[in-house]
Each structure stands twice: as structure tokens, then as C-alpha cells.
Interface confidence: medium
């Protein structure tokens, strides 16, 4: 969690002199309660916006907007504390709007916004706006919270942001899987335009259970420049047990921008239906998995011939 660095943070508006300050998330009014405190924010909205840094990078940001209630408590409103909590890490970042002048009633409802919290793809946040000073112990709460889920890197608008591109979002491996004779599976995918190694991970399951009955990892060495955008092939020898037939294949790149944390592309090949006419139909998914898996490191580029089913995936 961080603040976008590309411009001075502003909260002043006509009729209000205001400054944005870093906050420890523990306002002084917790420690020294006041007798008169303002009411809570109204109509808190959090939206996904995108913002450029001075360097030209594009980041997803949380756009936070709220209004004030039209009651006399605005006369005691000294500012607001904005808190963003990343739910999976419990990391919290706060800023404080400090009013340098007193709010007056005017014809239009007071509205505030802030668009400088940089958020991460696929993460969920709790956004809270506290009006200051905070209430006395046992007083009515004067904050509002909303949870905010940021789309992941598969979303078209997220794909082109700097954090997504850094994790390989623009690479489309177009994975295909062929089932060959002699208990073999050939995986083919398109290499990206970077001289970087890849891992292809196969995990097999029985149709009836979720437990893995077979797994193997193969390495693909960093391609040369003339091999960029070419197809790479890896052939796996499958488990000898016919019931160990539900295969999950992942291709994990190790791009320089994301190393072990690159987005993996995955394909699932279900067990064949016992029928002469049915071709197993794999289901493609796209899942960010953040820890690499260890395994055997033999690489085989095979041209085995055999009756095959072709499956095309993203």
C-alpha cells in the first residue's frame, strides 16, 4: 500500500482551507476525547480509477468520495482520517484531511474526494473515512466503511497497468494440449519476447477425488531471440494408472519484471468420457499463483506421433 507520488495532495476547495497530511492511523482525538464531535460521513463511494505517475506508469487507484450530512455538527468538523486496509495482509495506510478553516453551511452539500491510494490487482481492501475529532468512548460512531475489490490482471482495463504488465499480463501463451498414445501428454505454448526460463507443471487427479495422484515439473530453458513468439513443446509421460486421468497443466514464466511472482496460465484436461464420439473438453482458467513449485527438472522437446486431441486455450 502506498500513495501515488506524482503531484501534491490537495483537499482545499472554495470556502475551505485544507491540507493533506500523513497519518499514523491513530488520531489525537482517540487519546484526548472532545465533548462535541461531528456526525458520520454520508454516501461513501469507492471507485476504481487509473492514474499516471510522472514517469508515465499507469496504476490502479482507489477513488474515495463522500459527502457531509446537513446538520449543525459540521461546525465541529476539524477534518477526516482516510484509512485503507489490505485485508489479506492487514497492512493499513492512512492520510488525514486537516481543515485549517471552519466549515460554513452553504447552498451545496459539502463533498470530498481523494484518489491517491495505489491498490494492487486482485486485492480486497476495507476503506474507512473517520470524521475528526473521533467520538468519545461509547459515543455514536462517526465513520463509514466499505470493502473494495480490485479486478485482477485478466480484466481488460487492468491488463495495461504497470503492475499487471510487470507480472506478464500481456503474454498470451495460447496453451494447447494433445493426448498421445503410450500414456503421454504434449503441452505446447507460445514463448514471450524475453530470454527467460519457464516451468511447465503437470498435476494429475482421479476423477472422483481431489487428491493428487501424480505430478511432475519440466523446465524450459531461456529461449534465444530468434525463438521469441515461437511454440515450445513439452511431452509428459503420464501416470500408469488409467484412473489418474484428470490433468491440470500450468505454465509458469520467470520474466525479469516479476521473477517467481509472474502470472501462471493453466489448462485443465478432464478424464475422457467413455464414448467413441466424445472428445474430452478441457476448461481453461487463468490463476495467479504466487509461490513457485519445486519438482523434477528434465526438459524434453518431443515429436512423438500419435492419435491426438487438440485443445486450444488462453
Amino acid at each position: 500500500l502506498r500513495l501515488l507520488d506524482h503531484r501534491a495532495l490537495v483537499c482545499s476547495q472554495p470556502g475551505l482551507n485544507c491540507t493533506v497530511k500523513n497519518s499514523t492511523c491513530l488520531d489525537d482525538s482517540w487519546i484526548h476525547p472532545r465533548n462535541l464531535t461531528p456526525s458520520s460521513p454520508k454516501d461513501l463511494q469507492i471507485q476504481l480509477h487509473f492514474a499516471h505517475t510522472q514517469q508515465g506508469d499507469l496504476f490502479p487507484v482507489a477513488h474515495i468520495e463522500w459527502t457531509l450530512q446537513t446538520d449543525a455538527s459540521i461546525l465541529y468538523l476539524e477534518g477526516a482520517e482516510l484509512s485503507v486496509l489490505q485485508l489479506n495482509t492487514n497492512e493499513r495506510l492512512c492520510v488525514k484531511f486537516q481543515f485549517l478553516s471552519m466549515l460554513q453551511h452553504h447552498r451545496k452539500r459539502w463533498r470530498f474526494s481523494f484518489s491517491h491510494f495505489v491498490v494492487d490487482p486482485g486485492q480486497e481492501y476495507e476503506v474507512t473515512v473517520h470524521h475528526l475529532p473521533k467520538p468519545i468512548p461509547d459515543g455514536d460512531p462517526n465513520h463509514q466503511s466499505k470493502n473494495f475489490l480490485v479486478p485482477d490482471c485478466e480484466h481488460a482495463r487492468m491488463k495495461v497497468t504497470t503492475p499487471c504488465m510487470s507480472s506478464g499480463s500481456l503474454w498470451d501463451p495460447n496453451i494447447t494440449v494433445e493426448t498421445l498414445e503410450a500414456h503421454q501428454l504434449r503441452v505446447s505454448f507460445t514463448l514471450w519476447n524475453e530470454s527467460t526460463p519457464y516451468q511447465v507443471l503437470l498435476e494429475s487427479f482421479s476423477d472422483s477425488e481431489n487428491h493428487s495422484c501424480f505430478d511432475v515439473v519440466k523446465q524450459i530453458f531461456a529461449p534465444r531471440q530468434e525463438e521469441f513468439h515461437q511454440r515450445a513443446n513439452v511431452t509428459f509421460t503420464l501416470s500408469k494408472f488409467h484412473w489418474c486421468c484428470h490433468h491440470h497443466v500450468q505454465v509458469q514464466p520467470f520474466f525479469s519484471s516479476c521473477l517467481n511472482d509472474c502470472l501462471r496460465h493453466a489448462v485443465t484436461v478432464p478424464c475422457p468420457v467413455i464414448s467413441n464420439t466424445t472428445v474430452p473438453k478441457p476448461v481453461a482458467d487463468y490463476i495467479p499463483l504466487w509461490e513457485p513449485r519445486s519438482g523434477s527438472s528434465d526438459y524434453k522437446d518431443d515429436d512423438d506421433k500419435g492419435s491426438s486431441h487438440h485443445h486450444h486455450h488462453h
Partner: antibody, heavy 131, light 107 residues
């Protein structure tokens, strides 16, 4: 109610540059993506590209070398320039907004916002490329 | 590019009929798909977004379903004003791509 209006010359000579402007009324151009789409009898509906209000652009790779999309937030307008036109660029050109930010409310105060496609369209303007 | 195909390319139906149009994507697009109706000389109008959500102001006889690669638009009881051309649009990947359209005319 947001409305979009395309404007620009209806006739362009081959090899020249096609220039169109889309004016947004009834709402702000800020915080949305804005698209250009064209429709020709031979090719159906074709997405040309889009621009975010901050100036970030995405183009259709098939047209990228010839397309420039720009935005003028002060005028609530965005524009399309297509260079080196041929008769194949004859089409009805539409501008469109990339969806309202959707908010899905689950239990309590849960929110999920994202862009979900083109919801508001201009009425279209016909551009003929001919000498 | 993601190729969108639609079937049928045209169909003839009567008022009151149930009509189903299918759209297929060449690769998985989750639910990043919209359905549009276009009448001659008019701009496309969105009926369905996110594959199955009804656009505000659109009659409930229109519904959408599907996810991944296969999507369906259903008109439960065709009305005279529904005779038009229907397009699907994927907005999962750049470039966004439309289906070739399905023309619904009067039998």
C-alpha cells in the same frame, strides 16, 4: 442523462486524414474510458480504440499505425484521427462510453467496481472516402 | 485477437416466439460480454452486460446467460419492436471484438 455527438467531415479524399470529434454532454468526461467504433458493410462492427480521460490510449492493432485518439477534458470532447485513408475506411463512425462503473452489493457494505463495456453511444456519423 | 462467432446469422420468427441466439468466443472471456440490439440507421443499444445482467430500462423478456466461451441471448416472447440485428461484444481483451450479428426478421 449523458449524450454523445459525433462531428466531422462526411467526405474525405484517399490518402488524407479523417478527423472526427465526439462531444460529451449531460455528464463529465472524467473517470471513464471513451471509445471509437466503426461499422462498414464489409466488416461489421469494428472497435478502433479508446482513451481514458487522463490520456492513456488503447488501439486496435490492425489500425494502430494510422490511429490517434486524444482527449480535451476542458471541452468535454475526445477526437479520432485516422491517417492515409482508403475506400476501405468508408463507414459509419460511432463514439461510445465504456460503461458506468458497476457496483455489485453483496452482504453489508461490499463494493466491486469495474468497467464493463460500452453503454452509451453516439448516433453515428457517416464518413465516405472518395476522390 | 479473440474471434466472436454468432449463430444463427439470421432467423425468421413470429410475434410471441421464443428466440435464442448463441455467441461463441475463440478463447475464455469469463463474463466480459455484452449483447446489443441495432435497428437500421440507428446506433447499437446495449441490452445485457456482464453476460447476464439486464441493462436498466430494457424489458425483462431479454435475458443473457453463459460464461467462458459460450453465451446465449434469449427473447422469451418476441415483440414487434424486437425485429432487429443483435450483436455480442467481448471486452475482455484488446482489441475488443464484436460478433458478426444475427438478423431477426418477421416470418
Amino acid at each position: 442523462q449523458v449524450q454523445l455527438q459525433e462531428s466531422g467531415p462526411g467526405l474525405v479524399k484517399p490518402s488524407e486524414t479523417l478527423s472526427l470529434t465526439c462531444t460529451v454532454s449531460g455528464g463529465s468526461i472524467s473517470n471513464y474510458y471513451w471509445n471509437w467504433i466503426r461499422q462498414s458493410p464489409g466488416k461489421g462492427l469494428e472497435w478502433i480504440g479508446d482513451i481514458y480521460y487522463s490520456g492513456s490510449t488503447n488501439y486496435n492493432p490492425s489500425l494502430k499505425s494510422r490511429v490517434t485518439i486524444s482527449v480535451d477534458t476542458s471541452k468535454n470532447q475526445f477526437s479520432l484521427k485516422l491517417s492515409s485513408v482508403t475506400t476501405a475506411d468508408t463507414a459509419v463512425y460511432y463514439c461510445a462510453r465504456d460503461g458506468e462503473l458497476a457496483n455489485y452489493y453483496g452482504s453489508g457494505s461490499y463494493q466491486f467496481y469495474y468497467y464493463y463495456g460500452m453503454d452509451v453511444w453516439g448516433q453515428g456519423t457517416t464518413v465516405t472516402v472518395s476522390s | 485477437d479473440i474471434l466472436m462467432t454468432q449463430s444463427p446469422s439470421s432467423l425468421s420468427a413470429s410475434v410471441g416466439d421464443r428466440v435464442t441466439i448463441t455467441c461463441r468466443a475463440s478463447q475464455g472471456i469469463r463474463n466480459d460480454l455484452g449483447w446489443y440490439q441495432q435497428k437500421p440507421g440507428k446506433a447499437p443499444k446495449r441490452l445485457i452486460y456482464a453476460a447476464s445482467s439486464l441493462q436498466s430500462g430494457v424489458p425483462s423478456r431479454f435475458s443473457g446467460s453463459g460464461s467462458g466461451t459460450e453465451f446465449t441471448l434469449t427473447i422469451s416472447s418476441l415483440q414487434p419492436e424486437d425485429f432487429a440485428t443483435y450483436y455480442c461484444l467481448q471486452h475482455n481483451s484488446n482489441p475488443f471484438t464484436f460478433g458478426p450479428g444475427t438478423k431477426v426478421d418477421i416470418k
